[in-house]
């Protein structure tokens, strides 16, 4: 007349080495496993009863140890991976728009000795700022007197009037903004005179894009004469190095 080995629990372990058989009336003591602590008033022992079964322990009296509460960082949020601060869990940090994280994005609640502690210090959310954007030759940008630019602040470049008969063209993005990595969204543009040669075609003629002169991004369309076919593209664009792209087509019989 005996009980078999006592039941095992996730959060508790026997205080003594288990035996294969226990006499009726024999009692075993449990203790909380590492990382768990006792939560009174639940029992922590079990008895081998006359039916040769162990008297049940209705609720586990041990609960996981928890790391201390970490509030939301200023200008950000702390999000628990599965709703509790108990060890083995993770705390994720995100910053509001316009702020970036300094420190670890994830903290882990882990055991150190018998205590549950966070894997590091909570991060902080710092305002995103950009240095003033580059100055450019033959042009300027808005807010040129501002020293510090915040997230999504934008500046717009424009070209100066040219000293000669041909204007400066703005090559690149005219508007750039302060990005979340504290860098500007694009390189500063360039202001320079871009003028393509007059697009002449033999055995054909221009049918669209007429102009006095052909500056940056000017587009010209050609048509062949009767009995000829176009070699190349009928549409060309003046590119930033003052050449036609694709080149001026030819017309052949």
């Amino acid at each position: 007349d005996a009980c078999g080995p006592p039941p095992t629990f996730e959060a508790m372990e026997l205080t003594s080495k288990p035996k294969p058989y226990y006499k009726v009336g024999e009692q075993v003591e449990y203790d909380c496993k590492k990382g768990y602590h006792h939560f009174a008033p639940f029992l922590t022992h079990s008895i081998c009863d006359r039916n040769h079964t162990w008297l049940p322990i209705s609720d586990e009296p041990c609960v996981k140890k928890v790391c201390h509460y970490i509030p939301n960082p200023l200008h950000g949020e702390a999000i628990l991976a599965n709703g509790s601060y108990s060890f083995g869990n993770q705390l994720h940090f995100i910053c509001n728009d316009g702020y970036y994280l300094i420190g670890k994005e994830i903290l882990y609640c882990e055991l150190k000795g018998s205590d549950a502690v966070w894997s590091g210090r909570p991060p902080i959310c710092q305002k995103i700022v950009c240095k003033p954007p580059p100055k450019i030759n033959n042009g300027k940008h808005t807010f040129s007197d501002v020293e510090v630019f915040e997230y999504l602040d934008a500046v717009t470049y424009s070209c100066d009037p040219a000293p000669g008969p041909d204007p400066f063209s703005l090559i690149g993005e005219s508007t750039i903004y302060c990005r979340d990595n504290s860098l500007w969204s694009d390189d500063a543009p360039e202001c320079k005179v871009v003028k393509c040669r007059f697009p002449v075609i033999e055995n054909g003629k221009q049918i669209a894009g007429f102009g006095k002169k052909f500056y940056y991004k000017a587009t010209v369309i050609f048509e062949r004469d009767k009995g000829f076919h176009i070699i190349g593209s009928d549409t060309i664009v003046c590119n930033s190095n003052s050449t036609w792209d694709p080149p001026v087509p030819k017309c052949a019989k």
Partner: antibody, heavy 119, light 107 residues
């Protein structure tokens, strides 16, 4: 200022050839195209063709292909036009004129060279 | 090629007059038209390019206008040094072609 100095008058026999010159000064020679224009006595102007000194590319009036050959010598900033197999129809004043970036208007002209074809 | 016609081969005007010289193209030339002046001594000058743009150094009494096939050069206040032959030139299509010229004389 831009100046184009053309060579002096030529008296040539029918069937012969002649080489006219146009020396440019006052600007960067390779920046402008050189055009050649013909004017028969008491007549209007006829465009012969152009040459781009920077890369030696050229365009001719179909009518003058085989009659005129355009060349340049960038070292002396001089443009040349060779006229071949001359006939009395080629008796004319020949002008050189510059145009910028291939834009076909001619802001600066030489004084002209008179070519007379006569036996 | 495109034919350029200057129907008036010569015209007389008095000093101070407003003079208009016409030029028509055998097909539309989309404002790709220039005007030149040739003095009696043979020297040639560009006056107007792209229909109405005044070349630098040209007096403002010269102006150009037109569209499609019909173009004109106007001298608003005729001066003695304007005595010359005036040529139009198209450049929409190769070969570039000139009008036959209009000779301007003083009455």
């Amino acid at each position: 200022q831009v100046q184009l100095q053309q060579s002096g008058p030529e008296l040539v026999k029918p069937g012969a050839s002649v080489k006219l010159s146009c020396k440019a000064s006052g600007y960067t020679f390779t920046n402008y195209d050189i055009n050649w224009v013909k004017q028969r006595p008491g007549q209007g102007l006829e465009w012969i063709g152009w040459i781009y000194p920077r890369d030696g590319s050229f365009k001719y009036n179909e009518k003058f292909k085989g009659k005129a050959t355009l060349t340049v010598d960038t070292s002396s900033s001089t443009a040349y036009m060779d006229l071949h197999s001359l006939t009395s129809e080629d008796s004319a004043v020949f002008f050189c004129a510059v145009s910028e970036d291939g834009y076909p208007w001619f802001p600066y002209w030489g004084q002209g060279t008179l070519v007379t074809v006569s036996a | 090629g495109i034919q350029m016609t200057q129907t008036t081969s010569s015209l007389s005007a008095s000093l101070g007059d407003r003079v208009t010289i016409s030029c028509s193209a055998s097909q539309g030339i989309s404002n790709y038209l220039n005007w030149y002046q040739q003095k009696p001594d043979g020297t040639v000058k560009l006056l107007i390019y792209y229909t109405s743009s005044l070349h630098s150094g040209v007096p403002s009494r010269f102006s150009g206008s037109g569209s499609g096939t019909d173009y004109s050069l106007t001298i608003s206040n005729l001066e003695p040094e304007d005595i010359a032959t005036y040529y139009c030139q198209q450049y929409i299509k190769l070969p570039f072609t000139f009008g036959s010229g209009t000779k301007l004389e003083i009455k």
